[in-house]
């Protein structure tokens, strides 16, 4: 469960892949599309509002206990729109929604080496936002093998 309905802090950052491709957002036919692309040097990077939440981590052993704390985030590139996990389609989409946000808009934030982070679906543990064919997608990760996979590593820069 998320401890508070208010974020503990918020920040604006641009989002890029491990390989320094930018995550951009474009309004097309009244809906937003998400792109992973090389930006021209003079082009300004899109910013995302990251809202951080403190959350309880459920105990995986007992099933009903609590095993400490974790940080969750929501990502909003523009007012009233949030990144959401579509677990059925294994896709990442931008949806307009009102608060309280649905669980699909929350991602566990993982601190990774090389100054990178990863975003794990709250609704589907072990599934992360990743890059596939120049798009964002949901990627299932085996903890014991692929947590360092470059395609689920992202950089946040102010």
């Amino acid at each position: 469960s998320i401890t508070g309905i208010s974020p503990i802090t918020e920040s604006l950052a641009s989002l890029s892949t491990y390989n320094d491709q930018s995550i951009t957002f474009a309004l097309e036919d009244e809906s937003y599309e998400i792109y992973v692309e090389d930006l021209k040097k003079d082009k300004k990077k899109d910013k995302v509002l990251l809202s951080y939440y403190e959350s309880q981590h459920p105990s995986s052993e007992s099933g009903d206990g609590v095993d400490g704390k974790m940080l969750m985030v929501t990502l909003s590139p523009t007012k009233d729109f949030w990144l959401q996990a579509n677990n059925k389609e294994h896709s990442v989409e931008l949806h307009k929604c009102e608060k309280p946000l649905p669980d699909q808009a929350f991602f566990v934030l993982h601190n990774r080496s090389f100054n990178c982070v990863s975003f794990e679906c709250k609704t589907d543990p072990g599934v992360f936002i990743g890059v596939k064919d120049n798009h964002l997608a949901l990627i299932k990760v085996d903890y014991s093998e692929n947590l360092g996979s470059e395609n689920i590593l992202f950089k946040l820069s102010e």
């Epitope: 802090t9 951080y52 981590h57 940080l71 566990v108 601190n111 014991s144 093998e145 946040l156």
Partner: antibody, heavy 119, light 111 residues
């Protein structure tokens, strides 16, 4: 209940070797980053080494680089610290610590095991 | 490396009093908009216990009398009303970058 139990400490001569173990229980070990933190007698805390979940990355404090190796065996739920070329200044209680889920801070600590390097 | 300096080294107070502990970093411990500064409590013969993470968030099972504040380089741990079990050594620690570093500690003792 989440538990970390260290073992393997003891008295060793300068230049000697020791291997510390940390047996973890009560959580999915492979999902968590693990670390060793030490505390010299009557002194403060010093981070020693970290290994990520999935064994992908390791990091060490400069003073132990090339001498200490952190490793893990996820099938045995055990964390290790192989300590070679030990020096008097390595004398300390060594704590096994587990990061929180997401790897942002040291959340769970073992009781520690004492390593004494002396001739 | 980031050096953390805690003050005072020792704080002599009575139960029921308010304790204010300071931690100053040699450079900002902010990353991704988070202040990656944590506080631990350690009693003699025991391992440290997480009190506060990310500057102001209480760890699991930590009483509300413990609170953290601050950003950038200056941080404070406040114990609103000291209980007998609160007399201990308190450490701040940064998790912004390797090497992860701790302050030298503040001992809160009974006056």
């Amino acid at each position: 209940e989440v538990q970390l139990v260290e073992s393997g400490g003891g008295l060793v001569q300068p230049g000697g070797s020791l291997r510390l173990s940390c047996a973890a229980s009560g959580f999915t070990f492979s999902s968590f980053s693990m670390s060793w933190v030490r505390q010299a007698p009557g002194k403060g805390l010093e981070w020693v080494a970290t290994i990520s979940g999935g064994k992908t990355f390791t990091d060490y404090v400069d003073s132990v680089k090339g001498r200490f190796t952190i490793s893990r065996d996820d099938s045995k739920n055990t964390l290790y610290l192989q300590m070679n070329s030990l020096r008097a200044e390595d004398t300390a209680v060594y704590y096994c610590t587990r990061a929180n889920y997401g790897n942002w801070f040291f959340e769970v600590w073992g009781q520690g095991t004492l390593v004494t390097v002396s001739s | 490396e980031i050096v953390l300096t805690q003050s005072p080294a020792t704080l002599s107070l009575s139960p029921g009093e308010r304790a204010t502990l300071s931690c100053r970093a040699s450079e900002s411990v902010a990353k991704y908009g988070l202040s990656l500064l944590n506080w631990f409590q350690q009693k003699p013969g025991q391992p440290p216990r997480l009190l506060i993470f990310a500057a102001s968030n209480r760890g699991s099972g930590i009483p509300a009398r413990f609170s953290g504040s601050g950003s950038g380089t200056d941080f404070t741990l406040t114990i609103s009303s000291l209980e007998p079990e609160d007399f201990a050594v308190y450490y701040c620690q940064q998790s912004k970058e390797v090497p992860f570093t701790f302050g030298q500690g503040t001992k809160v003792e009974i006056k």
